[in-house]
């Protein structure tokens, strides 16, 4: 039922991904389905706004971290990728695309530089970055 998928370009070690649609999904073709979420890692570098538009065009959003347990595969992600977290200057908060405020329980934010967008890195870390900097990105679609 479970396949040990080793996606060398994405993860630091072996990740368990279910084989059968009945356990997870449905997801767009070639996306990763894991615990009722669909994920796709895009290799082309885009700025945050272009990354958001790319996800939206596929009926998805940029990555939202909402549960360490449900999203434990993210612990092993390699490199840095845009996620759907932005600083809203009008109220000073860091919010997800859906307007919810980031909980410090879910991500440790590291302020390497000034910026209004954030990159996801392994072990539930978020790195602040200038939104216009090109980076790879992760799209996510909830299946439930």
């Amino acid at each position: 039922i479970w396949s040990a998928v080793f996606l060398n370009s994405l993860f630091n070690q072996e990740v368990q991904i279910p084989l059968t649609e009945s356990y997870c999904g449905p997801c767009p073709k070639n996306w990763i389905c894991y615990k009722n979420n669909c994920y796709q890692f895009f290799d082309e570098s885009k700025n945050w706004y272009e990354s958001q538009a790319s996800c939206m065009s596929q009926n998805a959003s940029l990555l939202k971290v909402y549960s360490k347990e449900d999203q434990d595969l993210l612990k092993l992600v390699k490199s840095y990728h845009w996620m759907g977290l932005v600083h809203i200057p009008t109220n000073g908060s860091w919010q997800w695309e859906d307007g919810s405020i980031l909980s410090p329980n879910l991500l440790t934010i590291i302020e390497m530089q000034k910026g209004d967008c954030a990159l996801y890195a392994s072990s539930f870390k978020g790195y602040i970055e200038n939104c216009s900097t090109p980076n790879t990105y992760i799209c996510m679609q909830r299946t439930v």
Partner: antibody, heavy 117, light 107 residues
Framework: QVQLQQSGAELVRPGASVKLSCKAS????????MNWVQQRPEQGLEWIGR????????HYNQKFKDKAILTVDKSASTAYMQLSSLTSEDSAVYYC??????????WGQGTTVTVSS | DIQLTQSPASLSASVGETVTITCRAS??????LAWYQQKQGKSPQVLVY???TLADGVPSRFSGSGSGTQYSLKINSLQPEDFGSYYC?????????FGGGTKLEIK
């Protein structure tokens, strides 16, 4: 309901170590950071550090980096803090506190540590 | 690490008065600030989180405000049960610190 039950008062000799415990119940232990806070007599609150029960990641106040070690036992839903090389300066009430979504929403009752010869 | 400077350190006021306690951060903490009340011999209790959101069960005479590096807690029409110590705390980045505290006493 959420409860954090801390271990009892400790009287320890200078130079010794002590291990305090904080037993959590009423919530998913691995979903929230556990924090430890020091309050010396007639003084304010000082954040010692935090541990993520999910993967045991820790962050410490630099001041306590060589003083405190935070650990958890996930199977027992219990957080621990070991204090070493104790001096009279370490005599204080120590609290564990659960990080809610945006604040320390639940606190233990506190453990009094007295360092005296 | 970001430090929090709380003022005043102590304050005397009468029942019915309005008081304001301020908390200044050494860097932008993006509204990740909470306020706590502590009574003698008791554990602290949260009053306000995200700088301005009142915690469950907290009377509406308490209010939080501010952004960036400047925050404040206002208590309207002080009640006898409001006397005690107040602390601000931030949750930005990796190390989370408390302000030095404000002791609110009855005049």
């Amino acid at each position: 309901q959420v409860q954090l039950q801390q271990s009892g008062a400790e009287l320890v000799r200078p130079g010794a170590s002590v291990k305090l415990s904080c037993k959590a119940s009423g919530y998913t232990f691995t979903s929230y950071w556990m924090n430890w806070v020091q309050q010396r007599p007639e003084q304010g609150l000082e954040w010692i550090g935090r541990i993520d029960p999910y993967d045991s990641e820790t962050h410490y106040n630099q001041k306590f980096k060589d003083k405190a070690i935070l650990t958890v036992d996930k199977s027992a839903s219990t957080a621990y803090m070991q204090l070493s090389s104790l001096t009279s300066e370490d005599s204080a009430v120590y609290y564990c506190a659960k990080m809610g979504d945006y604040s320390f929403d639940y606190w233990g009752q506190g453990t009094t540590v007295t360092v005296s010869s | 690490d970001i430090q929090l400077t709380q003022s005043p350190a102590s304050l005397s006021a009468s029942v019915g008065e309005t008081v304001t306690i301020t908390c200044r951060a050494s860097g932008n903490i993006h509204n990740y600030l909470a306020w706590y009340q502590q009574k003698q011999g008791k554990s602290p209790q949260v009053l306000v989180y995200n700088a301005k959101t009142l915690a469950d069960g907290v009377p509406s005479r308490f209010s939080g405000s501010g952004s960036g590096t400047q925050y404040s807690l206002k208590i309207n029409s002080l009640q006898p049960e409001d006397f005690g110590s107040y602390y601000c705390q931030h949750f930005w980045s990796t190390t989370w610190t408390f302000g030095g505290g404000t002791k609110l006493e009855i005049k």
